[in-house]
């Protein structure tokens, strides 16, 4: 039975050219996390394997940094980075837990005058 829950940073906004940390946290389960996949729409950004460490997809290597923890740091943001991001926790014996984050990347001036979504 899957008892765990995923807490995420929810809806967040960031400034164009800046960086943002995408964070998920799995709680309320004793299941062992074997792998975490980070995806944007249907594109794989990165994998963190509990035994083998991080793999960053080559197409994102310049702009994606692993961590902190099982999170992911996106750098040099562009408006094209706006969209849904998913953290997919593969666990044993529970199975798969998925968290969703919506990121909106704003033009600098808009971000300065108050973002629609606040970073928690």
């Amino acid at each position: 039975m899957m008892t765990g829950t995923i807490e995420t940073t929810g809806n967040i906004s960031a400034e164009k050219g800046g960086s943002i940390i995408l964070q998920c946290h799995l709680s309320s389960t004793t299941a062992q996390v074997t792998q975490v996949n980070w995806e944007q729409q249907d594109q794989l950004l990165a994998i963190c394997n509990a035994d083998l460490g991080w793999h960053i997809s080559p197409s994102f290597k310049d702009r994606v940094a692993p961590g902190p923890g099982l999170g992911l740091t996106l750098q040099s943001l562009t408006v094209n980075d706006t969209g849904e991001y998913f953290c997919i926790y593969h666990t044993y014996p529970d199975g798969t837990y998925t968290g969703r984050i919506f990121l909106e990347v704003l033009e600098s001036s808009v971000a300065e005058h108050g973002a629609r979504f606040q970073i928690p």
């Epitope: 074997t34 794989l44 083998l52 460490g53 793999h55």
Partner: antibody, heavy 123, light 107 residues
């Protein structure tokens, strides 16, 4: 050309251990992870785990956790080993080493070159 | 773990005919799927990766398609050397898992 040459067939008693070797040639050994797959007689393929020959890091399928150990020869840097302990009759199978295609990572990692297989009989 | 299911278990086809093999994943693997061919007494041989890209030296009669959870391997015109067992494998989540195989036999 890439070649993976495995050690010869083994016959073991239940409770014993077996150590299968896989000698690689024709490419930079430390650049490609090596996987191990087994196949029981008349059955399908079963993933056992993977080793990074450069660092020695391993990831084992849950089913084999605690019974399997994958290592590499740090002196020659051309051979990996798979040791399976507490053998039972269900472990009778052909054991294959297989190279992960991608260089320097474990993803995307389909298996592009395979050893000839080592038959392990537990009886 | 991700369960890979292949169908049919056995496919009887005449030489020159088309063979269509199916592979289903218990959850999405995107296009992280490979196909292998195995003949009796031999090690598996890599045919397809990325669900649809042929490995080096694999004849054009082999083609793969699909994404997510449903995949197909098609052999457009079976040659005598194509009669074998075919396995699919996902490589997005450890442990990587294989389907149970489809045996393509001569009708």
């Amino acid at each position: 050309q890439v070649q993976l040459v495995q050690s010869g067939a083994e016959v073991k008693k239940p409770g014993a251990s077996v150590k299968v070797s896989c000698k690689a040639s024709g490419y930079t050994f430390t650049s490609h992870y090596m996987g191990w797959v087994r196949q029981a007689p008349g059955q399908g393929l079963e993933w056992m785990g993977v080793i990074n020959p450069s660092m020695g890091a391993t990831s084992y399928a849950q089913k084999f956790q605690g019974r399997v150990t994958m290592t590499r020869d740090t002196s020659t840097l051309s051979t990996v080993y798979m040791e399976l302990s507490s053998l039972r009759s269900e472990d009778t199978a052909v054991y294959y080493c297989a190279r992960l295609h991608v260089s320097g990572s474990y993803y995307p990692a389909y298996l592009d070159y395979w050893g000839q297989g080592t038959m392990v009989t537990v009886s | 773990e991700i369960v890979m299911t292949q169908s049919p278990a056995t496919l009887s086809v005449s030489p020159g005919e088309r063979a269509t093999l199916s592979c289903r994943a218990s959850q999405s693997v995107s296009s992280n799927l490979a196909w292998y061919q195995q003949k009796p007494g031999q090690a598996p041989r890599h045919l397809i990766y990325g669900a649809s890209t042929r490995a080096t030296g694999i004849p054009a009669r082999f083609s793969g398609s699909g994404s997510g959870t449903e995949f197909t391997l098609t052999i457009s015109s079976l040659q005598s050397e194509d009669f074998a067992v075919y396995y699919c494998q996902q490589y997005i989540v450890f442990p990587w898992t294989f389907g149970g195989g489809t045996k393509v036999e001569i009708k």
